[in-house]
């Protein structure tokens, strides 16, 4: 067991042009925090895969507000180390992922806005117990300076924290008039073979065949408890003397276990039984629990089912991550079809559809003309999600609701007289002209200049009344057909329009909540 420690020294704009001035968006002040994720081995794993060696979140840093004229400084950072405890052996090779997160301060449903500002991933070799390793990494336009190390927690020692050691003697204080006790090193597993019969509890050896006694014990095999009256004052403990240091307080005196841990004596030492959330030789290392409020954005913290997972965060809609620290950008998946606008309301997702489309994801392709009937016999022309009306003669405007005077533009040529009619206009041509607009001259011999053109109707022509009647019947039939078509389409799409109006109302209400 041990702890990986990361110290962030600085985070700020990298050198060179295009460096950002501020980590905050235009929406106002923000502050930073860091997440460290450790994965075993040197494989380039996805950032979202589990942090198998552990992960930690820093505290939030001080609020940063950009000073308009000032140069972009190194940004204010959270205090303290990031510590990632590991229970098993330190792997030596690992992937180190450091994420810099921005918290935009503001009042939004589900909490403040979080966004990932920078992520650095390094594959590293590191022995436990070694010195701090320093590093500088660039992530986009940002530069991160940091140090890290891995250290074992007693009784584990070694480069992988796999060798178990116990102190040679219990922590003791020297009595009055006695010289200070010499500091003793750790005795590790696979010790030298001591003199046959040497007490396992009270003796130890540094060389094979030796039997040296712990304080309070004497004799060739360290089996004899020391009588305090025979103690020879300043003499130190030795395998050849009966004099010794006066035994100090018991190893559990004064309870060396912190944070409510309970102490039990072991041969020559002590052992702490730590309460949930603490670990280490003296229960001095604090693990994060629900009481620390580790879940961001209104996540619910639940104690883990086993001691290895102190807590689990259950995130509100729109957030994810082990601490609900990541806002889910659900719009990046482009859920709105047919060019619809995606709105992530935090707790819900809405699509605002382009004209001509409806449904929760704008998946229904509406007939552009449905529900947008052109009045007075006009016909609707679809196109690109929009519509326009081709109006019957005598009407104009966007929906053919405006009555037009067909004779206003003087459509009859060569002095023809214009008569407005409900189906359009009729030209009464002056003598010598014919055609729908009196555009063709009639030759003296009665042959038109354009023989293929139909002869114009002049007032008094016997066919005139019949032709007008035919035109009227045809126009009425067309108008009736259009009306039937429009009504059927209106009915067909009414439910979509109703749903769309309701949904827009809800969206408006939620956005203003």
């Amino acid at each position: 067991a041990g702890v990986f420690e990361l110290q962030i020294h600085s985070f700020g704009p990298g050198p060179g042009p295009g460096a950002p001035r501020s980590p905050c968006s235009a929406r106002g002040p923000c502050r930073l925090f860091f997440r460290v994720c450790l994965k075993p081995g040197l494989s380039e794993e996805a950032a979202e895969s589990p942090c198998a060696l552990g992960a930690a979140l820093s505290a939030r840093g001080p609020v940063y507000t950009e000073q308009p004229e000032a140069p972009a400084p190194d940004l204010p950072l959270p205090n303290g180390l990031l510590q990632v405890p590991f229970r098993d052996a330190w792997p030596g090779t690992f992937s180190l992922i450091i994420e810099t997160w921005r918290e935009e301060l503001g009042d939004q449903i589900g909490g403040p806005a979080w966004s990932l500002l920078a992520r650095v991933t390094r594959r590293r070799r590191l022995a436990a117990g070694g010195p701090w390793a320093r590093d500088i990494q660039r992530a986009g336009a940002w530069e991160l300076r940091f140090s890290y190390r891995a250290r074992c927690e007693l009784p584990a020692v070694g480069t992988a924290c796999t060798r178990l050691c116990r102190p040679r003697s219990a922590p003791s204080r020297c009595g009055p008039g006695l010289r200070p006790c010499a500091p003793l090193e750790d005795e590790c597993e696979a010790p030298p073979v001591c003199r046959a019969g040497c007490s396992l509890e009270h003796g130890f050896c540094e060389q094979p065949g030796e039997c040296r006694c712990l304080e309070g014990w004497t004799g060739p095999l360290c089996m004899v408890p020391v009588s305090t009256s025979s103690c020879l004052g300043l003499r130190g403990p030795s395998s050849t003397t009966t004099g010794c240091l006066v035994p100090g307080p018991g190893p559990c005196d004064g309870n060396p276990c912190a944070n409510g841990g309970s102490c039990s004596e072991t041969p020559g030492s002590f052992e702490c039984t730590c309460p949930r959330g603490f670990y280490g030789l003296r229960c001095e290392v604090s693990g994060v629990t629900c009481a620390d409020g580790p879940c961001f954005n209104g996540g619910l913290c639940v104690g883990g089912a086993d001691p290895d997972s102190a807590y689990i965060c259950h995130c509100p809609p729109g957030f994810q991550g082990s601490n609900c620290e990541k806002r889910v950008d659900r719009c990046s998946l482009q859920p709105c079809r047919n060019g619809g606008l995606c709105l992530d309301l935090g707790h819900a997702l809405r699509c605002r559809c382009r004209a001509g489309f409806a449904g929760p994801r704008c998946e229904h392709d509406l007939d552009d003309c449905a529900g947008r009937a052109c009045a007075n016999g006009g016909t609707c022309v679809e196109g690109g999600g929009a519509h326009r009306c081709s109006c019957a003669l005598g009407f104009g405007g966007r929906n053919c609701r405006e009555r037009a005077d067909p004779c206003a533009a003087r459509p009859c040529a060569h002095g023809g007289r214009c008569y407005a009619h409900f189906s359009g206009l009729v030209c009464a041509c002056a003598p010598g002209y014919m055609g729908a607009r009196c555009e063709f001259p009639v030759h003296p011999d009665g042959v038109s200049a354009l023989p293929a053109a139909p002869p114009g109707l002049r007032p008094g022509d016997p066919q005139r009344a019949g032709v007008i009647a035919v035109i009227v019947v045809v126009v009425i039939a067309i108008v009736a057909g259009i009306v039937v078509l429009v009504i059927s389409r209106k009915k067909r799409m009414a439910k979509y329009e109703k749903a769309e109006i309701k949904e827009m109302g809800e969206m408006h209400r939620e956005l203003n909540a």
Epitope: R60, L105, G106, I109, G110, G293, G298, H314, C315, A513
Partner: antibody, heavy 119, light 107 residues
């Protein structure tokens, strides 16, 4: 162990004011949203107000029925959350609970303090 | 506002029974529903969140189901200590709203 203790309730006349307090212990108070929920036989459980963290500029949200009359506040140094009740009405009568808030459910509740608005 | 309706104000049951309490939301709330238990003279306690997740220390005889607008809290093998009021609550949007409650009684 999480503990929430409300105080400040009592009898008050319509139009009157009072301030409810809630002292928290057993958790890192400054890292949690806090809320007030009230309960009456007539209206059942009713969410009243919520206050978020310092990092959220102590953003507050209120039920429509109390907006403009009630004010929620907190003092992280004292691990306390408060509810100032002004212009009280008969329908504000009920037991007011302080809850350790979040968005996914109210994990811990105090024992409640009774507010009675009556002439 | 989203209205949470618990249509049964009272339900009679016997020890060992399987009991299902229903709650209906006035609009789609996904799975953002919590359930609370309140024993006489006590404060409410969180039982389930996100429709079906049991909170710390809640026995596994309490289960939740549903999504959208219809939700159910089920108690299998009803115990005497389960006699209480049960409330649903939505946290899909402000204002956070509770159901009117369902009281479990012994037949």
């Amino acid at each position: 162990e999480v503990n929430l203790e409300e105080s400040g309730g009592g009898l008050v006349q319509p139009g009157g004011s009072m301030k409810l307090s809630c002292v928290a212990s057993g958790f890192a108070f400054s890292n949690f949203w806090m809320q007030w929920v009230r309960q009456s036989p007539e209206k059942g459980l009713e969410w009243v107000a919520q206050i978020r963290l310092k990092s959220d500029n102590y953003a507050a949200h209120y039920a429509e029925s109390v907006k403009g009359r009630f004010t929620i506040s907190r003092d992280d140094s004292k691990s306390s959350v408060y509810l100032q009740l002004n212009n009280l009405r008969a329908e504000d009568t009920g037991t007011y609970y302080c809850t350790q808030g979040n968005w996914v459910g109210f994990a811990y509740w105090g024992q409640g303090t009774l507010v009675t608005v009556s002439a | 506002d989203i209205v949470m309706t618990q249509s049964q104000k009272f339900m009679s049951t016997t020890i060992g029974d399987r009991v299902s309490i229903t709650c209906k939301a006035s609009q789609n709330v996904g799975t953002t529903v919590a359930w609370y238990q309140q024993k006489p003279g006590q404060s409410p306690n969180l039982l389930l969140y996100s429709t079906s997740n049991r909170f710390t220390g809640v026995p596994d005889r309490f289960t939740g189901s549903g999504s959208g607008t219809d939700f159910t809290l089920t108690i299998t093998n009803m115990q005497s200590e389960d006699l209480a009021d049960y409330f649903c609550q939505q946290y899909n949007n402000y204002p956070l709203t509770f159901g009117g409650g369902t009281k479990l009684e012994i037949k």
